[in-house]
């Protein structure tokens, strides 16, 4: 359905007030340096011109595409060059190759402050005083340091941050009633940006096919009552949602999203019984709560899958007429049979199946070949069930804080190239996958641990890949999508690292450390683990343990001296000392 | 399970001194920060020196810096308390300790293994 002017369309169909969010989340994610007073102009300028061309969609310019439109605008930045450098070159490029080129400049880890959180009462006064700056403000400083948010979810963050304001800033105890939502709204907008990173991943550098893939395994599994067709139209729209979001077509994306919702709502009986309550809800609420929900039950008396898969006489047939199809349907019946497997696992057995087939069907006795391609998934099912139970049993033991140790230590052994912040992060992320995961049965201790580990991982993928040093991360990123977890987990201690040199600045550490938080307090003690570990991998567990409570001794005296820089200057220089001794630094 | 046993304490006069041990059985030995606390009657158990893993670095109460001097040998699983200038405040039943897995360096509940303790009594 062509319409003359896309512009003109989009903003009938979003309104006013979510066009102008998601253009500017569109420009903060583009132009992640630009300060918040330049997007605004921006922004009210595109808006202008849509409202021109809502009242005549023939006026100059209004049949131009949206990329030309928002890119001609981004290009007008005077400081283009000063503060992006090579990135002002994509201004010399026509549509399409100009937003590619846009698209390929978005920073994973912007070189940008962190946010600090102003006093409860100043935030409040913000609010009062100008409530739409306030929130826009918010959606411009989360989407110019996560260029990738799911733009339309960011639109229902925004409003539970505007609904929490309104609420807590004329509650007797705002700090009491305020903090803990910010907090919640901060983890999951942590979170929803790391999964929203792996599928523009996914989608990126695997393409379409390992994304419908994907889509096709998790909604099965959350849909197992729908019939095929069912599903394969919801991956194919789906597809289309995330294609457009990923690739800055965020107005698009956004509207595409809502009809994607409204078809779900309508044709709830033949998708889930979990929906009832998701579709009486108001648009951005209803989209959430529809990306959430629980598993549907599973049809009883489900029929065996070797039946069609392995025993009937037409599977080379059925497999050379419509090979994806086929597939598909392997990965929907098995999906929607396991929903205590993870989505990867799922994805590694139709691997198998489709290479045994490609085998099988070329060979003399087909049935004969492929007869026993069950037997193979045993040993990749087992894999990530044993793994998941050893760390559960590691995590239950040690707790998270000394968990996300552990897997520093780990980490650090396999690829200790790494920048310290990314193995900081990275770790402490794959150590919460204990409090996340492991309080469940067993039936969804590994959906939820592998395939959030593959979120860490893809955040280290991506992170590395802005700064590539080492093959070995490469390897595991790029090789395959699904078996990345399996190839970090199978990687040992990298016997080629030359141990960093030591300096004593690196383990240098002053008073302001007594004042941070719990958290900010662990991370720098990770870090001082970390470049342990880099200075000597050769150290035990045992002795990295034993240095580490040395630290926390340090720590902990220091912090409770009169003179704590002092302190910490003199048995600092005497803690590196001793440390030296014992472990040759 | 970890067995500690103190010896070394006995009667003395101020400003003599006493050096006590404190052997070790069981887990490993060396992985693991010692420490000294003491409870005089009447009083709370009391931190007194913290000896690392490896004993190239000690941590002690003001009340005793610069007249103990805490040390181990790996080798020999023992860890000792060397004690100078002793004075009457001293008197006290000493415990040695093993560090634990968490908690603070400066407090009993941070140690896992406690010996039964040995009686140091300061006249003057």
């Known amino acids: 359905d062509a319409h003359k002017s896309e512009v003109a369309h989009r903003f009938k169909d979003l309104g006013e007030e979510n066009f102008k969010a998601l253009v500017l989340i569109a420009f903060a994610q583009y132009l992640q340096q630009c300060p918040f007073e330049d997007h605004v102009k921006l922004v009210n300028e595109v808006t202008e011109f849509a409202k021109t061309c809502v009242a005549d969609e023939s006026a100059e310019n209004c049949d131009k595409s949206l990329h030309t439109l928002f890119g001609d605008k981004l290009c007008t930045v005077a400081t283009l060059r000063e503060t992006y450098g090579e990135m002002a070159d994509c201004c010399a490029k026509q549509e399409p190759e100009r937003n590619e080129c846009f698209l390929q400049h978005k920073d994973d880890n912007p070189n940008l402050p962190r946010l600090v959180r102003p006093e409860v009462d100043v935030m409040c006064t913000a609010f009062h005083d100008n409530e739409e700056t306030f929130l826009k403000k918010y959606l411009y400083e989360i989407a110019r340091r996560h260029p990738y948010f799911y733009a339309p979810e960011l639109l229902f963050f925004a409003k539970r941050y505007k609904a929490a304001f309104t609420e807590c800033c004329q509650a007797a105890d705002k700090a009491a009633c305020l903090l803990p939502k910010l907090d919640e709204l901060r983890d999951e907008g942590k979170a929803s940006s790391a999964k929203q990173r792996l599928k523009c991943a996914s989608l990126q550098k695997f393409g379409e096919r390992a994304f419908k893939a994907w889509a096709v395994a998790r909604l099965s599994q959350r849909f197992p009552k729908a019939e095929f067709a069912e599903v394969s139209k919801l991956v194919t729209d789906l597809t289309k949602v995330h294609t457009e979001c990923c690739h800055g077509d965020l107005l698009e994306c956004a509207d595409d999203r809502a009809d994607l919702a409204k078809y779900i709502c309508e044709n709830q009986d033949s998708i889930s019984s979990k929906l009832k309550e998701c579709c009486e809800k108001p648009l951005l609420e209803k989209s959430h709560c529809i990306a959430e929900v629980e598993n549907d039950e599973m049809p009883a008396d489900l029929p065996s899958l070797a039946a069609d898969f392995v025993e009937s006489k037409d599977v080379c047939k059925n497999y050379a007429e419509a090979k994806d199809v086929f597939l598909g349907m392997f990965l929907y019946e098995y999906a929607r049979r396991h929903p205590d497997y993870s989505v990867v696992l799922l994805l590694r057995l139709a691997k198998t199946y489709e290479t045994t087939l490609e085998k099988c069907c070329a060979a003399a006795d087909p049935h004969e070949c492929y007869a026993k391609v069950f037997d193979e998934f045993k040993p990749l099912v087992e894999e990530p069930q044993n793994l998941i139970k050893q760390n559960c049993e590691l995590f239950e033991q040690l707790g998270e804080y000394k968990f996300q140790n552990a897997l520093l230590v780990r980490y650090t052994k396999k690829v200790p190239q790494v920048s310290t912040p990314t193995l900081v992060e990275v770790s402490r992320n794959l150590g919460k996958v204990g409090s996340k995961c492991c309080k469940h049965p067993e039936a969804k201790r590994m959906p939820c641990a592998e395939d959030y580990l593959s979120v860490v991982l893809n955040q280290l993928c991506v992170l590395h890949e802005k700064t590539p040093v080492s093959d070995r991360v490469t390897k595991c990123c790029t090789e395959s999508l699904v078996n990345r977890r399996p190839c970090f987990s199978a990687l040992e201690v990298d016997e080629t690292y030359v141990p960093k040199e030591f300096n004593a600045e690196t383990f240098t550490f002053h008073a302001d450390i007594c004042t941070l938080s719990e958290k900010e307090r662990q991370i720098k003690k990770q870090t001082a683990l970390v470049e342990l570990v880099k200075h000597k991998p050769k150290a035990t567990k045992e002795q990295l343990k034993a240095v580490m409570d040395d630290f926390a001794a340090f720590v902990e005296k220091c912090c409770k001296a009169d003179d704590k820089e002092t302190c910490f200057a003199e048995e600092g220089k005497k803690l590196v000392a001793a440390s030296q001794a014992a472990l040759g630094l | 399970q970890v067995q500690l046993v103190e010896s070394g304490g006995g009667l003395v006069q101020a400003g003599d001194s006493l050096r006590l041990s404190c052997a070790a059985s069981?887990?490993?030995?060396?992985?693991?920060?010692m420490g000294w606390f003491r409870q005089a009657p009447g009083k709370e158990l009391e931190f007194v020196a913290r000896?690392?893993?490896?004993?190239?670095?000690?941590y002690y109460a003001d009340s005793v810096k610069g007249r103990f001097t805490g040390s181990r040998d790996n080798a020999k699983n023992t860890v000792y308390l060397q004690m100078n200038s002793l004075k009457p405040e001293d008197t006290a039943v000493y415990y040695c300790?093993?560090?634990?897995?968490?908690?603070?360096?400066?407090?009993?509940?941070?140690?896992?293994?406690w010996g039964q303790g040995t009686q140091v009594t300061v006249s003057s």
């Open positions: 300790a093993q560090r634990g897995d968490s908690g603070s360096n400066y407090d009993p509940s941070g140690y896992s293994y």
């Open positions: 069981g887990r490993t030995f060396s992985g693991y920060a």
């Open positions: 000896i690392n893993w490896s004993g190239t670095l000690t």
